[in-house]
Amino acid sequence: MNGRVDYLVTEEEINLTRGPSGLGFNIVGGTDQQYVSNDSGIYVSRIKENGAAALDGRLQEGDKILSVNGQDLKNLLHQDAVDLFRNAGYAVSLRVQHRL
């Protein structure tokens, strides 16, 4: 045993249309707010009921978001990631990693 836990993951491109109340999910993570040990990536922490993401159905709590509209989310401060989502426009393309 090397002490590391390996997970099966799959990647997916999810295209969301911003709804009346936005994209409808929360995020955690970032270089200044690591939520997952030794990983400063951005993760979905909550999906708002009846929000755009929930109605689409593909994004799940615990998913890692790799990019937004083609922009890599590596090495971002938490608030910079939040601002990126808030300013992402009407049609938002997410590259996400689901853990199986």
Epitope: G22, L23, N26, I27, V28, D32, S45, R46, H78, Q79
Partner: nanobody
């Protein structure tokens, strides 16, 4: 889960000030967005203000901008609402709320559906 306990409410004259506090239990307090809502008799619970986990981002309802200030002390697991220039229409029960992570949507759209954890509330009464 997070438990929230509000304090600091009371009776104040119009033009006066109050400072509400909300003490939270939980070891990952800085990962939670914290908010304040109020509910007047016979009305729905309405958004007042919110603050991001690090305190670097805040949002306010139009009705309180310039009068109310939200802040937090992550070392004390506490969020505050400084309420100045109070008006009789500010009279309501004030609730502290918490949700894990940061909403990717502007606080312009905030509602009670955006929060998962709630305190019991503290009454604020502003007299003429």
């Amino acid at each position: 889960d997070v438990q929230l306990v509000e304090s600091g409410g009371g009776l104040v004259q119009a033009g006066g000030s109050l400072r509400l506090s909300c003490a939270a239990s939980g070891h990952t307090f800085s990962s939670y967005t914290m908010g304040w809502f109020h509910q007047a008799p016979g009305k729905e619970r309405e958004f007042v203000a919110e603050i991001s986990g690090t305190g670097g981002n805040t949002g306010y309802a139009d009705s309180v901008k310039g009068r109310f200030t939200i802040s937090r002390d992550n070392a004390k697991n506490t969020v505050y609402l400084q309420m100045n220039s109070l008006k009789p229409e500010d009279t309501a029960v004030y609730y502290c709320a918490a949700v894990i992570g940061s909403p990717t949507d502007s606080s312009d759209y905030r509602s009670s559906l955006d929060y998962d954890y709630w305190g019991q509330g503290t009454q604020v009464t502003v007299s003429e």
